[in-house]
């Protein structure tokens, strides 16, 4: 297993609709044809997998059914979008990239993106 640098933004604020997007960029030492991207969430020293996708030569990442993630890729950049976020989902979201093929296998883990989610205030009753 060889190490690889992965860069991602330090902080992202989710939209009022609970959607957060960020770019995960990896420094590929060669021409990988099969890449696996995993988003991990770290909160209270617990790490859980949010979503994962393996992609090849295309620009659309396909996630498992009912995943809260969507994504596209361009070169060594992966554009990730996480949907359905609520305030309780605030935490550090870590991008993990694996170059699966061809050998050698490379693994890179980013420092994480702190995603802040603020639940929208309910609309006040209107007199109109």
């Amino acid at each position: 297993c060889k190490a690889m640098h992965v860069a991602q933004p330090a902080v992202v604020l989710a939209s009022s609709r609970g959607i957060a997007s960020f770019v995960c960029e990896y420094a590929s030492p060669g021409k990988a044809t099969e890449v696996r991207v995993t988003v991990l969430r770290q909160a209270d020293s617990q790490v859980t997998e949010v979503c994962a996708a393996t992609y090849m030569m295309g620009n659309e990442l396909t996630f498992l059914d009912d995943s809260i993630c969507t994504g596209t890729s361009s070169g060594n950049q992966v554009n990730l979008t996480i949907q359905g976020l609520r305030a309780m989902d605030t935490g550090l979201y870590i991008c993990k990239v694996e170059l699966m093929y061809p050998p050698p296998y490379y693994l890179g883990i980013g420092n994480g993106t702190q995603i802040y989610v603020i639940d929208p205030e309910p609309c006040p009753d209107s007199d109109f």
């Epitope: 044809t33 099969e34 393996t54 992609y55 090849m56 030569m57 295309g58 620009n59 659309e60 396909t62 996630f63 498992l64 059914d65 009912d66 995943s67 969507t70 994504g71 596209t72 699966m100 093929y101 061809p102």
Partner: antibody, heavy 115, light 106 residues
Framework: QVHLQQSGDVLVKPGASVNLSCKAS?????SYWINWIKQRPGQGLEW???????????YYNEMFTGKATLTVVTSSTTAYIQLSSLSFEDSAVYFC????????WDQGTTLTVSS | QIVLTQSPAIMSASPGGKVTITCSAS?????IHWFQQKPGTSPKLLIY???TLASGVPPRFSGSGSGPSYSLTISRMEAEDAATYYC?????????FGGGTKLEVR
């Protein structure tokens, strides 16, 4: 030029298993998914699953779990689908298609399950 | 799984006429892709990533849409366009196709 060539049409009895092949040429085999698609007579397209030829990574449509098994032999740039415990409902045309974009398809293999 | 509903299921158009086929997803998808299939042949990639024409596809074909609603348009129908058209999503597994729209020439 890119070409996908499947095995010939097959007639089998219920309960049997069958292996269909998809021989790829004209591109780097390990750089693209191989997808398998089923089409029953007069019906639409159903995605069975896909395999990454380099690593062997597979994804299946749950509807075909236990029915279909995808494999590859990279040395011969050939992908295979094994269909087991065949029933009449498995009678269909089976296609293989290349990559994320399904940009090249083979001509299809007709599988007929009949007693 | 994401269900793609195509409409209409069957339609006819006169040569030179405009044709629009819609594809509605049960959940928002990143892109929709379109295939054309003529009887006895394998499907052919027509449009990918919602609006990009595949190599060799005539410019009378176009695709558009976002979120859950997409469409395929033929600006001027030609006899050779008679076929069944399928939309497809690759946002989540399992990959799914629409039920198809059979387009006949009037």
């Amino acid at each position: 030029q890119v070409h996908l060539q499947q095995s010939g049409d097959v007639l089998v009895k219920p309960g049997a298993s069958v292996n269909l092949s998809c021989k790829a040429s004209g591109y780097t085999f390990t750089s693209y998914w191989i997808n398998w698609i089923k089409q029953r007579p007069g019906q639409g397209l159903e995605w069975i699953g896909r395999i990454a030829p380099g690593s062997g990574t597979t994804y299946y449509n749950e509807m075909f779990t236990g029915k279909a098994t995808l494999t590859v032999v990279t040395s011969s740039t050939t992908a295979y689908i094994q269909l087991s415990s065949l029933s009449f409902e498995d009678s269909a045309v089976y296609f293989c298609a290349r990559g994320d974009y399904f940009d090249y398809w083979d001509q299809g293999t007709t599988l007929t399950v009949s007693s | 799984q994401i269900v793609l509903t195509q409409s209409p299921a069957i339609m006819s158009a006169s040569p030179g006429g405009k044709v629009t086929i819609t594809c509605s997803a049960s959940k928002s998808v990143s892109y929709i892709h379109w295939f054309q299939q003529k009887p006895g042949t394998s499907p052919k990639l027509l449009i990918y990533d919602t609006s990009t024409l595949a190599s060799g596809v005539p410019p009378r074909f176009s695709g558009s849409g976002s979120g859950p609603s997409y469409s395929l348009t033929i600006s001027r129908m030609e006899a050779e366009d008679a076929a069944t058209y399928y939309c497809q999503q690759r946002t989540t597994y399992p990959l799914t196709f629409g039920g198809g729209t059979k387009l006949e020439v009037r």
